[in-house]
Interface confidence: low
């Protein structure tokens, strides 16, 4: 049994920031779950992770240099991405895994959202050039 995910087909980030809402056919209330956002047709870059545990505060992090925040709804997770670069325009996929209670569940691959970063051309620092194009 797989969780279904709905995403908007295309979002335009005018000021290098965008809210991407991942809507699930599953209620996350009182569940331990890991929601993530992935960049590229091959989902090679894990952009942001929202980890929820009914007994702890929501954890939001990125291990790939993205500036992200996350908000939880009963059947949705919204990722707020900031400081996006124009060359990070790509297709982004929502993923969800429910670890507890059993059984472990994950989602059918969603159809993805094209995020078109249309805002100012931010210049990546030489020390951290930002995630590369796939």
């Amino acid at each position: 049994n797989k969780i279904l995910v709905k995403q908007s087909p295309m979002l335009v980030a005018y000021d290098n920031a965008v809210n991407l809402s991942c809507k699930y056919s599953y209620n996350l209330f009182s569940r331990e779950f890991r929601a993530s956002l992935h960049k590229g047709l091959d989902s090679a870059v894990e952009v942001c992770v929202v980890y929820g545990n009914y007994s702890q505060q929501l954890q939001v992090y990125s291990k790939t240099g993205f500036n992200c925040d996350g908000k939880l709804g009963n059947e949705s997770v919204t990722f707020y991405l900031q400081n996006l670069y124009v060359n990070q325009t790509d297709i982004y996929f929502c993923k969800i895994e429910v670890m507890y209670p059993p059984p472990y569940l994950d989602n059918e691959k969603s159809n993805g959202t094209i995020i078109h970063v249309k805002g100012k051309h931010l210049c990546p620092s030489p020390l951290f050039p930002g995630p590369s194009k796939p």
Epitope: S8, P9, M10, I114
Partner: nanobody
Framework: EVQLVESGGGLVQAGESLRLSCAAS????????MAWYRQAPGSQRELVAA???????YYADSVKGRFTISRDNAKTTVYLQMNSLRPEDTAVYYC???????????WGQGTQVTVSS
């Protein structure tokens, strides 16, 4: 079910032009976004151009100024006018359309574009 019919691919010389078209038919509720991807041999599929229902447009840097995406909402058709073609534009070009209220992407079968030098 939705059908996408792509046409316009072919073999051209560098510097020449081609116009791809993709017509969507079937159980179309509303078309939100229409896009073109391409995949060259041994490469990942790449987003080339996209246009949404209010005609906001995206182009990959590699095609800016050479390719133009447009859509005919009445005919539920998307076009890709490709000018000043280069050998590196050689790829299979896929039409990608979001045609339902469920935010579901449909992919065409692809049309081959070959640019010889």
């Amino acid at each position: 079910e939705v059908q996408l019919v792509e046409s316009g691919g072919g073999l051209v010389q560098a510097g020449e032009s081609l116009r791809l078209s993709c017509a969507a038919s079937g159980s179309i509720a509303s078309i939100k976004t229409m896009a073109w991807y391409r995949q060259a041999p041994g490469s990942q599929r790449e987003l080339v151009a996209a246009i949404n229902y209010i005609k906001e447009i995206y182009y990959a840097d590699s095609v800016k100024g050479r390719f133009t995406i447009s859509r005919d909402n009445a005919k539920t058709t998307v076009y890709l006018q490709m000018n000043s073609l280069r050998p590196e534009d050689t790829a299979v070009y896929y039409c990608v359309v979001d045609v339902t209220k469920e935010d579901y992407w449909y992919w065409g079968q692809g049309t081959q574009v070959t640019v010889s030098s």
